[in-house]
Structures are given as C-alpha cells and as structure tokens.
C-alpha cells in the first residue's frame, strides 16, 4: 500500500493507482470558524437532496452505453472510468483506483443442459438449454433422481423424510443464497442442484425467463482465499473451501415445470408454492445435469474516491456499491447503489466546498466491481489492505439494492449500529406515507444476520469493520434480480416514486456519514454487544447439564463476559469524564471503541483457511453459533456431537470474548486481570 | 411403530352407501401416497383406488369410478373412502395401504392395514 | 388395462425347493413398476419387491425378481416353511387403474 504524504501527517489509505494529486477540496469562500451543528447539517443534507434527479441518474446508468456489464467487461470498465471522472469533477481530495487480476466463471460455448433420461441413461427428452448459468458450479455431468428441497434450507431437507445422496436437488430461489443451498445440497451426498423461480414466490409472467448468480460460499476471488488476487502476488495455487464440488444450474420456471411433469408426489402445503410443484422423479426417470462453465482471468477495477477529514483524516468511513451485473439486468441490482454512490459524491462534494462542512474523519466513496461474484472486488480490496484498514476503516455502509419497494424498510448491520440507524429511522420520513422510518421499537429484532451475497458482509467478518446494508423492499423477493428483465422501466414500475424512495435512502446513508464522521464522539454504540453476549449466554445456558456432564464450567465465560460488561461501563464513563474539546484524549477512547469488532475476529484460526472470523457473524466451528449447534447435537444425537471439537470452541470462544474486554479496557494495566 | 387402521365396515343394503377411516400412525403420513385395496371372499386382490400425498391427485379402478371417493385429511393423519350405490360386487375385505417410497405416487405399497369386511346384501 | 397373468395357478413344493413364479403382463410395464407380494391366510399382503427386482426392507435374499417388458419372475431360491403362501405381482406404471395377477398358490407338496 503506498502513502500519502500529508503537509502535516502520513495518512495510510489503500490505493494502488493515483490518478489525482490535489492533496485538499477546493473550497469557496466560507467561514471556516463556525462549526455546522447537526440539526443545520441535517437540514443542509435534505435541502441538497431535494434537488437532485436521482432516477434521471439510473436510468442513464441502466441504458445500453452501460449494460451488459459483467465485471471486466468493457462496459464496466467505460462505467468506472466515467465514476472515476465524476469524481474528479467533485474535486475530491484524492482519486485512485484498484487492479486486481481474478478468477471469475462463465459460461462455454459448449450449452449446459438439463436432460430427462430413462432409468437406462437413454434419452426421454431435452427439458432445456437453460440460458442462464450459476458461477463457481463444479463443471460435470450428473444423472440421478430429482428430489424437490423447498427453498434448499437446513430445515428442508431434514423435513424431506427422503435421502438425496446420489441425487440431484431442485431447490426455489430465495429465502438463502444459491451458495448456501448447494452447500447444504452437497453437505447431505447431492450430486447436483437446479434451482428456479416458482411463480408465487416470483410472479414473472415469462416463465422461459432465465437468471444468474454464483456457488461460491464465500466472498472474493475463490482462488485467492484470504489473500490478495494483485498480479505480482507469489501465492501458490489455492482453491476457498466454499466453492461446490458439485454442479449447479438455474433453470426457467418452463423447465422446472416440464420436469415436475415427470415428478411424482405434492409439495407440501405449507411451502405455500405453485400446484404444478412435485417432489420426486417417477421411478423410471432420471435427470442428467450437465455444466460446461469455464474459469476465466478477468481485470477488474475498483474506483475510489476520498474526501479528507479535517481534524482525523486517518480514520475513515466507506461507502460502497456494486457497478456490475452478470446478464443484462442492472437496474436494481447496481443502477440504483451506484447512482446513489454518485450523487452522495456530489452532494457532500458540495456540502465542503460551498457550505462550509467540515468532516472531522474521512469519507472513502468506492466502487466496487465484480459483486455478482460475490462481493469479489470489495473482498479483494480488504484482503489487500487489512492490515492498512486495522483501527482506520471504522464503518462499511453498503449502498447495494437500497430500493426494491416501498413498503418496508429493513436493515442488516453490526450492532454497534444499532443505535445510530435508530436515530436515524427517527428522523427521516418515509415518501410515500410521510411516517417515521422508526415503526417498530422492537425493529432491532427483526434485523437480519448479514448475508453471504451481501457486500457488507465481508467488512463485517471478515474484516472486522462494523458495517450497515439497508433497502427499502416488499415482504416478497423483488423477482426481477438476476435476469434480464432487471431493468428501470421494470423497475419504476414496481416503484412509481423511484425517486422519492432513492433520495429517502440517500438520506439515510447521508445522515450516518455526517453523523459518523462529524461527532466528536464515535457513533458507535459498543454496549449494544452486551446483550448480544448476554443472549449468546443465555443460549448455552440450556445446556449446563450437558457442559457439567463433561467435566467443563461456563464459570469462565461468565466471568468474561462480566469483564465484557465492565470495560463498556468503564469506557462510557471516560467518555462522561472526557474533555470534549481535548482532541487527545477524544481519539483514544474512540480508537478503544474502533477495536470492539476487529476484537470479535477469533485470532485462532488463519484467515486463509476462514476468513469469516467473526465470532458472532462469521462462518466456521469458531463461531459462536457453530458451538451452539454442536452443542444441540449432543442431545439430539450423541453420534454427531464432536465432544474434542466442543471442548475447542468453547475454550477459544471464551478467550476471543475475554480479548475484546481486555482490547476494550485500554491499555494493559487498566486490565483485570484476575480471570 | 408404523400402523395403519381401518375402520367403518359392515353390513349395507346395495344402494346404500358407506365411508371407511384408515387412521395412520408412526409415520410422516402428509408424505406418503395412500391407496385402498379390496380382497372379495376367497378370491384375489383389486386395486381400488389412489391419492396423492397432499390430496392432489386421485385415481379409480373402473369398476368403482363415479361411486366411491377417496379423500384424506392429513390434519387427522386419517384416510378415507366414501362408497356410494353399493352393489353386491363391491362386498370384500377393504385394506389401506402405505405406499412404499415418501412422495411417490406409482410405487408398490409396503405398509397394510388388518382390513375392515364390507358387506352388501338385502 | 393392463391384464397380468400369473402361472402357475398353483405350485406345489417341498421346503428347500426352489420356486419360480411367472407374471406375464398384456402390455409392456415398465421394469420400475412391477411389484410382488406374498399373503398369508387371515393376513394382510406384504411387500416383496418393487421395481421389479428391488427387495422391500426386511425382505430375505432368497427372494428376488426379475424381467422386463411383458415377462417378469418371482424366485425363492430356497422355500423355507413360512414362504408357504399366495403371491401376487402388481403392475402400477400405466396410467391408473393399477391391476393385480390372479395370484399363485405355492403349497407344501
């Protein structure tokens, strides 16, 4: 990573190509001395966006100029040069971008196909040449029997009451990610998966329509696990352990319709799904699966952009969106995340250079390419800079699919958001019914874990950077994600106030950024985790017979999760006795409130082997949940319960927890050290 | 303990009608294709008819089509066989029976009731 | 409908014997769709095989059946005392109605 030389400090930011030099925004003629109090900060922000065409912006960015645009596709590349220039014209303190060389997947020229044949492998007759594919599928043919998973869910397919080992899986989009569902697919001997899009949970009236997306559990260029894909990188081959070893195809709803004729038994009625659904292929008929995908190199950009704080430029918060889209169909997916991204830009562009507001920490726009991958050039930004983006990169908001509806708002984050997105929700009024965003003060129950396909995801656990991902969507899926039809005029149909709905999420993303990087105290509540700690806790509690049974106490973990709670004690009562104008003193306990998440990564396991190391949100026997479920088993089935395994999580689950009270407490003789 | 027990035979005039119970146990019966077989005295076995394990799918030997309905209600775990203008012919031991394979609706039947005798005279 | 024959009507062995029942059916069937069973008097059938060859679970090995087609065979390698009963085959993959053969006796000689 290069440095920046400042006049006075060295501020590390992750960049690989400059492409500006200006070192401070060019300012007009505004008293500087006076400093912007929140309520004129919040009332500058609204007025700035009151004046900005955002669907203008979406529908230029979802026009033929800019689609298709798959990553490294010179589409994307025209995109990011021309959010590189926009940029510029913002007069940003600095302007660069990031190269990566990765391994995505496409589809060859030879067609995967989906083929009913005899229980003699001869053929009965082609169901389809399905015009969609799923990235990082296994290439190879399968034939077996085709047995129905629901939504391919854990739950699923232990209420099958039927085994799918040597069988290939028909699974519905939604609910989890492809990734999830192969995974469970081939945890359980699937041999292959065919997922579709049922019409009541997608009501598409073009059943042949055909859909993408990826296999890869995980994030980042899956042939760089854990490490940078740069060119020069030395590494040797490698391959993530979430990429399927078995093959994965999307087929049209006329597909899965033309096999259900060859499928016996009724869906169950509770999976609240089309008549025409069945279970199991006749006896005397098999399902052959082929994929012919091909791994392709592909450069990639991301393209950064950042305004300086004024007082701590070396802390930053990053706002992000995805600008590519595998197929034709962009505009919900990344016209709508990186039009926001861009007119955000420009209004807190505006904000400094006209009005006067001063940021005290500093604000990173990205752009981030190849995120129908998963999250593969975000991944690949983090990987290559963790350790310049340690106790720096203090907040992830993520600008992805902010609009699919109107009816509901729904937030995914780190709960030291909580609070601040609380807030937030208080202030900012929804366009259509002029309400509060704030419904509900049991809202916080209802946020969803962030999941796998989610850009945020990464900042969060792998990374360890608090992060926010929130939209505007219906109860039901917006169905148009991932096929061709994801397009503006789609879209404005489904949201006639596109408009109103963006400017309302830019609101929202706005008021966090100001609130983030303007407070003289971070915005991030780090007692929030205390009751997460509690609930985890509570949990395990369940089960003192069974952890008395082994030999084991959860004395330990009481005890550090007491030490948890007084270091957040102590830290909110240094910030009640802290001088606020002492900047000093002000970073030091912000720089203790940076280190909450960033603790919560296990330190015992290789990022290269698991990269999601948080143990609340990450993936893995480390995490939390993963002691949980083992531990379930025990009493469910004593056969499966890992009792060395358990001894393990519990024990290191117990450290990690004692190390982020210990990393909260400050410097080591602030430190009890009677555990 | 994977049972079937069927229920509501006796002495019926023809013409007359009848509805026979088959209550399952032991097993997911929400999952499984239920068919009614009939053994008449002394002679062999008839198929008599077919449902589907969610109820949507049915199907009738020719001889009982127009006049028995099969129905089930999985709520109850209880399967059913409504038998209308009852003929002399119809007069058998009545069995339920499990299809073999979850989900299948065209597959042998591994699980039998103990039966329940209908009989139709004047 | 499918007409499924059996023969013989009745076959009349000794234990240890090796028995051979035929169905034959008045069109093809397929394979996955054949099914035997075995009917004690005052019981109800039990399954056999299915699939024409596949043995029902719990199902000794000395039973086992075969064919394609029209023509399928039910064979007990080795008749033990308790294998002393009528066997039916069933076809159920045409279009219902699904039928049953006539059955065959196999007695003690």
């Known amino acids: 990573c290069k440095r920046v030389e400042q006049k006075e400090e060295c501020v590390k930011l992750a960049e690989t190509e400059e492409t500006d030099k200006s070192e401070t925004m060019e300012t007009e003629d505004v008293p500087t001395s006076s400093r912007l109090y929140w309520a004129d900060l919040k009332t500058l922000l609204s007025e700035k966006l009151n004046s900005i065409e955002f669907a203008d912006t979406i529908k230029q960015l979802s026009q033929n100029t800019y689609t298709p645009r798959e990553a490294g596709s010179q589409k994307d590349e025209s995109l990011a040069y021309y959010i590189e220039n926009q940029f510029h014209e913002f007069k940003f303190s600095k302007v660069w971008r990031d190269e990566h060389y990765v391994k995505i997947q496409v589809k060859d020229s030879a067609q995967n196909s989906v083929i009913i044949v005899d229980k003699n492998g001869r053929l009965v007759y082609l169901v389809e040449n399905p015009g969609g594919y799923v990235a990082y599928s296994k290439a190879a043919t399968v034939t077996g029997k085709l047995v129905h998973a629901n939504f391919g869910t854990k739950k699923d397919f232990e209420d099958l009451y039927t085994p799918v080992n040597g069988s290939i899986v028909i699974v519905r989009a939604g609910k989890i990610t492809f990734a999830e569902k192969v995974a469970n697919a081939e945890s359980l001997n699937a041999i292959g998966v065919l997922i579709y899009m049922d019409q009541t949970k997608f009501p598409i009236v073009n059943a042949e329509l055909s859909f993408f997306g990826h296999a890869h559990l995980g994030t980042g260029d899956p042939y760089t696990p854990g490490f940078p894909s740069f060119n020069h990188t030395q590494f040797p081959p490698s391959r993530s352990s979430g990429l399927p070893n078995i093959p994965v195809q999307t087929i049209s709803r006329a597909a899965a319709e033309k096999l259900f004729g060859n499928m016996e038994g009724d869906c169950p009625s509770d999976w609240k799904t089309d008549s025409t659904c069945r279970m199991v292929t006749s006896e005397s008929k098999n399902v052959k699966l082929t994929v012919s995908n091909v791994l392709k190199e592909r450069r990639i950009l991301n393209i950064f952009g950042v305004i300086k704080g004024y007082e701590e430029p070396d802390r930053y918060v990053v706002v992000g969106a995805q600008r590519d889209a595998l197929g034709a169909g962009v505009a919900a997916k990344s016209s709508v995340g990186t039009g926001l991204l861009l007119k955000l830009a420009q209004v807190f562009s505006d904000m400094i250079s006209k009005d006067g507001f001063r940021p005290s920490r500093s604000i990173i726009f990205a752009s981030w390419t190849a995120g129908d991958f998963g999250a593969v050039g975000a991944t690949e930004w983090l990987e290559g800079y963790l350790s310049s983006l340690h106790l720096k990169a203090f907040t992830y908001i993520n600008l992805d699919k902010v609009v699919l509806g109107t009816s509901n708002f729904k937030v995914s984050a780190s709960p030291l958001l909580y609070t601040l997105m609380g807030k937030i929700m208080q202030d900012v009024k929804h366009p259509v019914d002029g309400k509060s965003l704030y419904r509900d003060s049991n809202w916080i129950s209802k946020v969803e874990k962030l999941s796998f396909d989610n850009a945020a995801y990464p900042f969060l656990a792998y990374s360890g950077i608090p992060a926010v991902s929130f939209c505007f969507c219906e109860d039901a899926d917006y169905p148009y994600l991932g096929t061709r039809l994801d397009t503006y005029e789609a879209l404005t149909q489904k949201v006639p106030q596109l408009n109103q709905m963006v400017r309302t999420a830019a609101e929202v993303a706005g008021q966090l950024i100001i609130k983030l990087t303007h407070d003289v105290e971070l915005n991030l509540d780090y007692e929030r985790y205390n009751s997460q700690l509690l609930s985890f806790v509570r949990d395990l509690n369940q089960y003192r017979a069974d952890i008395k049974e082994m030999g084991l106490s959860l004395q330990w973990l009481y005890s550090a999760r007491g030490d948890f709670f007084r270091a957040t004690s102590r830290l909110t009562t240094d910030f009640g006795n802290a001088e606020k104008t002492d900047r000093f003193v002000m970073k030091k306990l912000n720089d203790r409130v940076m280190r909450v998440e960033y603790h919560f990564l296990s330190p015992y396991v290789s990022p290269k082997e698991s990269p999601f190391r948080h143990v609340f949100w990450g993936s893995g026997s480390h995490t939390l949940p993963a002691l949980l479920e083992n531990l379930k088993l025990r009493k469910q089935n004593n056969g499966a319960f890992n009792e060395t395994l358990f001894r393990n999580q519990l024990a290191l689950a117990t450290w990690t927890i004692q190390g982020a009270a210990n990393a909260l407490s400050g410097d080591v003789w602030d430190i009890d050290n009677e555990f | 303990y994977v049972q079937l027990v069927e229920s509501g035979g006796g002495l019926v005039q023809p013409g007359g009608s009848l509805r026979l119970s088959c209550a399952a146990s032991?097993?997911?019966?929400?999952?499984?294709?239920m068919n009614w077989v009939r053994q008449a005295p002394g002679k062999g076995l008839e198929w008599v008819s077919v449902?589907?394990?969610?109820?949507?799918?049915?199907d009738y030997a020719d001889s009982v089509k127009g006049r028995f309905t099969v129905s089930r209600d999985n709520s109850k775990n209880t399967l059913y066989l409504q038998m209308n203008s009852l003929r002399a012919e119809d007069m058998a031991t009545y069995y339920c029976?499990?299809?073999?394979?979850?989900?299948?609706?065209?597959?042998?039947?591994?699980?039998w009731g103990q039966g329940t005798l209908v009989t139709v005279s004047s | 409908e499918i007409v499924l024959t059996q023969s013989p009507g009745t076959l009349s062995l000794s234990p240890g014997e090796r028995a051979t029942l035929s169905c034959r059916a008045s069109?093809?069937?397929?394979?996955?769709?054949l099914a035997w069973y075995q009917q004690k008097p005052g019981q109800a059938p039990r399954l056999l095989i299915y699939?024409?060859?596949s043995r029902a679970t719990g199902i000794p090995d000395r039973f086992s059946g075969s064919g394609s087609g029209t023509d399928f065979t039910l064979t007990i390698s080795r008749l033990e005392p308790e294998d002393f009963a009528v066997y039916y085959c069933?076809?159920?993959?045409?279009?219902?109605?699904?039928?049953f053969g006539q059955g065959t006796k196999v007695e003690i000689k």
């Open positions: 069109q093809s069937v397929s394979s996955s769709y």
């Open positions: 032991g097993f997911s019966f929400d999952k499984y294709t």
């Open positions: 069933q076809q159920y993959g045409s279009s219902p109605p699904w039928t």
């Open positions: 449902i589907s394990n969610g109820g949507v799918s049915t």
């Open positions: 029976a499990r299809a073999s394979q979850p989900w299948l609706y065209r597959t042998g039947a591994d699980v």
């Open positions: 699939g024409a060859s």
